[in-house]
Each structure stands twice: as structure tokens, then as C-alpha cells.
């Protein structure tokens, strides 16, 4: 491509030249593809609202839990077990939490009257000891409740444990009470207030609308918009039993999904509530199942700071708000249409694939001869020829050879390495069909000239008897008219080519060779046809006529312009042309690759 470009180069437009195939089958396939693709594109556009600009929801949540629970605690006082009744209200069983969560206590373990002093550890595998050697001064085990003093002391009876400095008495390692102490929390209700905003669409709304009946309770089918939820119902929705979860605690997700269509003509923006258990219900005992934490109530007794430690089991409810708001946007629509246009090319890809497959050598040689029902597919070879133009890479080694006694042309795409071109087999290439309209450009004399009596026509060249070989003709010559090459040794083999593959009459003896290639009148006409005011001296005229004769022969014998560029003229023809239009001095240069 040239380095500089003119202004006119800028104002250009390139387009592809197409082949239109009039075919019922391929037409049907094309429209089938187009209808299917168009239907899918339209369906996806409408069902997924791909014409909208979508924006994620921004949300804030506020919750209120209501309910009263009566708790029956079993306590030991002076070695006697007593049943204590107490009432728990919202302040007793809920704890302030961060983010979109709230917690409801369902069970607990109390260790009362703890103060800081020395005492034996609660007996466990890690704290039981038989001597002081089993304890270490200053040791703090992650599972322990204090710092070891290094002494092994009696805990109870004959049980000895390591002494620690800690809040004493040490909290007992025991299971959560069964059933859960606040089992009635199943009947507690929670009101969820959820405000949402789509700032990009300048739209705000909330889950509680002005006309809402605040005595309602959420039900998946009967009351799906009620923002008041009974805790037991939430667990029933997920297939869990509240009483079972209440013992060890757990985590429950309340999902609020906003799928908002903010277009005026289809406006809809209401929440959908769903529930999901978020903790691992299959957890092994060693991996701490459920949900619990400890908190303490501190007080002073006789000027000594004491505390009641409570291990709280309960359910943490996480409110997860998500969703999108969509509004019509012309840019989104254009982008979507643009992204789907390429799908319409699938029909062309598929049909091209069929044409290429059915016109392959494999089908021609292995399928069509045996399969009669596949015969109609042979038409694809015709389509393929019309659709595709095969071009051979113009390597320096590329040469085309045409023998008068062969119907095809030979392509030689290799180095000769000292072998005569006559002897190189090459690859058979079909001879291009003759375009007879080109003959109309030749002078009338060529058409009208009557056949000369006794002059053999080209068709007579196919006679079986061979012309006698002249004594000077080289070994590779089959027509008896070839001459040895004058080129250096390294390039000589390129000119060692005859007009025939098998012995016979030379093409130069044909009347058409004389009329098309050697006729000065015809060649001058062709030169003037290209340059009407051409005026040359004898020497340059001979040179121009000689090269025009080479070109005429190549076009005549090879047909295709591309092949003619790489055509090697037989020695007999080359020397006959040189004899007719000689060079006054110096050697002939021979064939040169055009690229």
C-alpha cells in the first residue's frame, strides 16, 4: 500500500460482491434461520426487558420484634432444685445488632455469682490432672476459662483439676436445655420496614404502603405483601422445625427481592419475600453447631464486683435486600439490537458450510459414486465454483505447463534441481473454459482467412505418427523442433520443455499458431489496441512483438490470466517466435517470475 494517500482515497467505499443462489432448499434454510433467530431475539427482548437500563437497589431496613415469653427455669438453691417462673419481654430476648440483622434469644445457660479469684477448672479432658506436673503456671489454654497457677487441686470428690485465676465458679461445660427455655418465641412477630431507592431513575418507595392493615400476618399465598412475620412461619417455609433450632440457635435469612419495572405503561414495584436457612444444620458437635454467644450482667455485692454470665442461644435473622429497577432506554435497545445482528449471519455460515462440505473431494470420490440419493447434492460443486475463486500463492517456484496432447494443464510448484521441466510430473489442473468473446477483438482477417491447402490444422496434431526428430533436437524433445537452451547451467532446466508429452507433430506447425502467435498483422493490431498511437523503431518493435507473441501463446494455451502469468513456453514455440521477431544483438533473457 502506498505510504501517502490522496484526498480521493479517503472518499471511497468498499463493498462485497455477492453470489445469489436461486435455490428452494437454501432459501428455505435461510428463512428458517432468520425466523427462528428473529423470534428468539424478540422473545428475549421482551421477557428479559433488555430494552431497559437496569440499576441495583439501595436499601435501608428497620425491624421491630414483638411478643412475650414465660420461662420456667430450674435452679439449685442450697442443694435443692427449684422451678422459677419468669416473664421475658422484647428488652430481655433481643439484642442490638449491626446492619440488617436482629437477634431473638431462644435458650440460655446461666452461671450466677461469679467473682475474680482462684478456683479449680471445670473437669474436662484438658483440665483433669493427677499431679502438679499436669498443670503449668501461667498457662492459658484457648479452651480454658483462666490462667493456670501450676497447682493440681481437688474439684469435687476424688476429681482433681488444674487451679486457675478466673471468674469463679467456672462456667460448667453442659448441653443447652431441652426443650428450649424460650420455645414460645415461635409465636413472636417481627415487623420489617424496608425503604428502597433507585437514584439513577430518581425513584423511591417502601414495602409498607399507606393503606396497609397493620394487624395482618404474612402468608405466602393469602397475604404475600404483609410485612409482619411470625417467626414459626418463617421456619415452616424453609422446612425446619422452630423447636429444634431454638435449642442450639441458628441463622435465618429473610430475602426481600425487588424486581421493579419503572416504565409508565407497565409500572410495577412491589417486594417478594422468601426465606433461607443460612447456618449449617448438619454441623458436627465438635464444630460448634447453632448460634450462641456469652454476655454478662455485672453488679456489686459487699463492695465486691460480681457478674452473672449468660450463654445465650438464639436465632439471628439476616435481612437480605436485593433486586433491580429497570426503565426504558433507547441506548440499551440499540446496543441489544446491535449485539443480535450478528446472529442473522448464522444462516450464511451454515449454508456455506453445506456448500463447502458437499463440494469436497471426499464427497465427490467416496459418497456420490455409491449413494444415489446424494446425487442431487452434486449441484453444490457448481455453486462452489461460482462462489469461490482459488488462487495459488505466487511463489518464485510456481510454473504452469501445457502439452498439446493433454487435456489438462500441469502446475509445477517446486524447484527443478537440475531436472528438465519436461520430466517433472507436477499437479494436474483443469484447463479454464475458453471465453470465445475474446476472439471478437481480433482483426477480421484472422476470422476470414480461408484454410491454406496442404497446411495441417491444430486438430491434426493429434495424429499418431511422430515427426522425425532432428539431429540437433535435445533428448527431452518430443516434436523434433526444440533447440537447446542458451541460458546458464543453473537456469537451463526451466527451458527444457517441449510442446508435447509424447512424440508427435509440433504445435508450431499448426495454422492457428501461425495466425494467432506469428502473424505480425495480428500482433501489431493487439499492440495498437493497447496503445493506439504507438510508433516504434524496428528493434524495439521486434522486442514488443516478440513479447506480445509470447503473451498471445500463453493466453491461447492457458486461458486464465493468472496461469498465463506463470506459463512456461515450450522450447519449440519460444525459438519459433524468436526466429520470427529476432533480437539484433545479445542473448535472450528467458522466463522471469512476474512477482
Amino acid at each position: 500500500m502506498p505510504a501517502c494517500c490522496s484526498c480521493s482515497d479517503v472518499f471511497q467505499y468498499e463493498t462485497n460482491k455477492v453470489t445469489r443462489i436461486q435455490s428452494m432448499n437454501y432459501g428455505t434454510i435461510k428463512w428458517f434461520f432468520h425466523v427462528i433467530i428473529f423470534s428468539y431475539v424478540c422473545f428475549a427482548l421482551v421477557s428479559d426487558k433488555l430494552y431497559q437500563r437496569k440499576e441495583p437497589v439501595i436499601s435501608s431496613v428497620h425491624t421491630k420484634v414483638k411478643g412475650i415469653a414465660e420461662v420456667k427455669e430450674e435452679i439449685v438453691e442450697n442443694g435443692v432444685k427449684k422451678l422459677v417462673h419468669s416473664v421475658f419481654d422484647t428488652a430481655d430476648y433481643t439484642f442490638p445488632l449491626q446492619g440488617n440483622s436482629f437477634f431473638v434469644m431462644t435458650n440460655f445457660l446461666k452461671t450466677e455469682g461469679q467473682e475474680q479469684r482462684l478456683c479449680p477448672e471445670y473437669p474436662t479432658r484438658r483440665t483433669l490432672c493427677s499431679s502438679d506436673r499436669g498443670c503449668k503456671k501461667g498457662w492459658m489454654d484457648p479452651q480454658s476459662k483462666g490462667i493456670q497457677t501450676g497447682r493440681c487441686v481437688v474439684y469435687e470428690g476424688n476429681q482433681k483439676t488444674c487451679e486457675v485465676s478466673a471468674w469463679c465458679p467456672i462456667e460448667a461445660v453442659e448441653e443447652a436445655p431441652r426443650p428450649a427455655l424460650l420455645n414460645s418465641a415461635e409465636n413472636f412477630t417481627v415487623l420489617i420496614k424496608n425503604n428502597i431507592d433507585f437514584p439513577g431513575h430518581n425513584y423511591t418507595t417502601r414495602n409498607i404502603l399507606p393503606g396497609l392493615n397493620i394487624t395482618c400476618t404474612f402468608h405466602k399465598t393469602q397475604n404475600p405483601q404483609c410485612p409482619i412475620f411470625r417467626l414459626g412461619d418463617i421456619f415452616r417455609e424453609t422446612g425446619d422445625n422452630f423447636s429444634d433450632v431454638a435449642i442450639q440457635g441458628g441463622i435465618m435469612g429473610i430475602e426481600i427481592y425487588w424486581d421493579c419495572n419503572l416504565d409508565r405503561w407497565f409500572h410495577h414495584c412491589r417486594p417478594k419475600y422468601s426465606f433461607r436457612r443460612l447456618d449449617d444444620k448438619t454441623t458436627n458437635v465438635s464444630l460448634y453447631p447453632g448460634y450462641n454467644f456469652r454476655y454478662a450482667k455485672y453488679y456489686k455485692e459487699n463492695n465486691v464486683e460480681k457478674r452473672t454470665l449468660i450463654k445465650v442461644f438464639g436465632i439471628r435473622f439476616d435481612i437480605l435486600v436485593f433486586g433491580t429497577g429497570g426503565k426504558f432506554d433507547i441506548i440499551q435497545l440499540v446496543v441489544y439490537i446491535g449485539s443480535t445482528l450478528s446472529y442473522f449471519g448464522l444462516a450464511a455460515v451454515f449454508i456455506d458450510f453445506l456448500i463447502d462440505t458437499y463440494s469436497s473431494n471426499c464427497c465427490r470420490s467416496h459418497i456420490y459414486p455409491w449413494c444415489k440419493c446424494c446425487q442431487p447434492c452434486v449441484v453444490n460443486e457448481y455453486y462452489y465454483r461460482k462462489k469461490c475463486e482459488s488462487i495459488v500463492e505466487p511463489k518464485p517456484t510456481l510454473k504452469y505447463v501445457s502439452f498439446v496432447d493433454e487435456s489438462h494443464i500441469r502446475m509445477v510448484n517446486q524447484q527443478l534441481l537440475g531436472r528438465s521441466l519436461q520430466d517433472v510430473k507436477g499437479q494436474e489442473v483443469p484447463r479454464p473454459a475458453m471465453d470465445f468473446t475474446d476472439l471478437s477483438r481480433l482483426p477480421l482477417a484472422l476470422h476470414d482467412t480461408p484454410p491454406i491447402p496442404g497446411q495441417p490444422e491444430e486438430i491434426q496434431l493429434l495424429r499418431k505418427e511422430a515427426t522425425p526428430r532432428s539431429r540437433d533436437s535435445p533428448v527431452w524433445c518430443q516434436c523434433g523442433s526444440c533447440l537447446p537452451s542458451q541460458l546458464p547451467e543453473s537456469h537451463r532446466c526451466l527451458e527444457e520443455l517441449c510442446c508435447r508429452k509424447k512424440p508427435g507433430a509440433c504445435i508450431t506447425t499448426s495454422e492457428l499458431f501461425r495466425k494467432l502467435v506469428l502473424s505480425r498483422h495480428v500482433l501489431q493490431f493487439l499492440l495498437l489496441y493497447q496503445e493506439p498511437l504507438l510508433a516504434l523503431d524496428v528493434d524495439s518493435t521486434n522486442s514488443r512483438l516478440r513479447h506480445c507473441a509470447y503473451r498471445c501463446y500463453a493466453t491461447w494455451r492457458f486461458g486464465s490470466q493468472d496461469m498465463a502469468d506463470f506459463a512456461i513456453l515450450p522450447s519449440c514455440c519460444r525459438w519459433r517466435i524468436r526466429k520470427e521477431f529476432p533480437k539484433s544483438e545479445g542473448q535472450y533473457s528467458g522466463f522471469k517470475s512476474p512477482y
Epitope: R125, R126, L128, C129, S130, R133, G134, C135, K136, W139, D141, P142, Q143, S286
Partner: nanobody, 129 residues
């Protein structure tokens, strides 16, 4: 769950040697601290030797310098090499295992029988002339 089987016990003369072996079943053997304890008739169970999952060892005062504990995690075995045996070494020798999956047993606790959850049936060692 780990099953432990002791072997190698028998009668030996004072000053002689014996090699006890404890074979454990279970794929998580390498996560267990292993110990040897012994109980002579009419006496309390006594600590002999132990080896943690990461290879640290501890020996009872009466066997230090004479007994050697090791472990082969590939074969799931814990051998106890007993040299210079004395008549007072006569006892029923037990193999024990302590789970260290959720936390290593501190070295100073390896001798505590309370640390060990799993116990073998025992193998008898008799030292007499």
C-alpha cells in the same frame, strides 16, 4: 474413631530388651498424640512414654534413658523400644491415643491419662530370671 491393638509382650530376663508395638486403625492417625501407660497388679496406671502428632516426646521418670518411643505414620504404628529391663517393669502395657485435630496437646500434658480418649486392651510384659 480409632482402634488400638498392642503386641510384642512376653517374658524377658532382667537387663534384656523387648519391642512393643501399637497398631492403630483409622485414616487420621497422624492427627493423634500416642502414649504408652502401664499398670502393675494392685497399682495405679502409670505413664511410660508419649509422642505428639508433630513428634515431640515425653517419658516417665522411671524409664528415662532406657525406653524409646517413635511413630510410623505410613504404617499407623507406634513402637516402644524397651532396653535394660528391670523386674519392676513387669506390668500390663497399654497404648493410648489423644485427638489433636482441634488443637495440640501441650507437652506438659502428654503424661496425663485424662488427655487420652482411646485405649487398647493391653499386652503383658514380665521381667523375671
Amino acid at each position: 474413631e480409632v482402634q488400638l491393638v498392642e503386641s510384642g509382650g512376653g517374658v524377658v530376663q532382667p537387663g534384656g530388651s523387648l519391642r512393643l508395638s501399637c497398631a492403630a486403625s483409622g485414616r487420621t492417625f497422624r492427627h493423634y498424640a500416642m502414649g504408652w501407660f502401664r499398670q502393675a497388679p494392685g497399682k495405679e496406671r502409670e505413664f511410660v512414654a508419649a509422642i505428639s502428632s508433630y513428634g515431640s516426646t515425653d517419658y516417665g521418670d522411671s524409664v528415662k534413658g532406657r525406653f524409646t518411643i517413635s511413630r510410623d505414620d505410613a504404617k499407623n504404628t507406634v513402637p516402644l523400644q524397651m532396653n535394660s529391663l528391670k523386674p519392676e517393669d513387669t506390668a500390663l502395657y497399654y497404648c493410648a491415643a489423644a485427638d489433636e485435630t482441634l488443637g495440640a496437646v501441650p507437652n506438659f500434658r502428654l503424661h496425663e491419662k485424662y488427655e487420652y480418649e482411646y485405649w487398647g486392651q493391653g499386652t503383658l510384659v514380665q521381667v523375671s530370671s
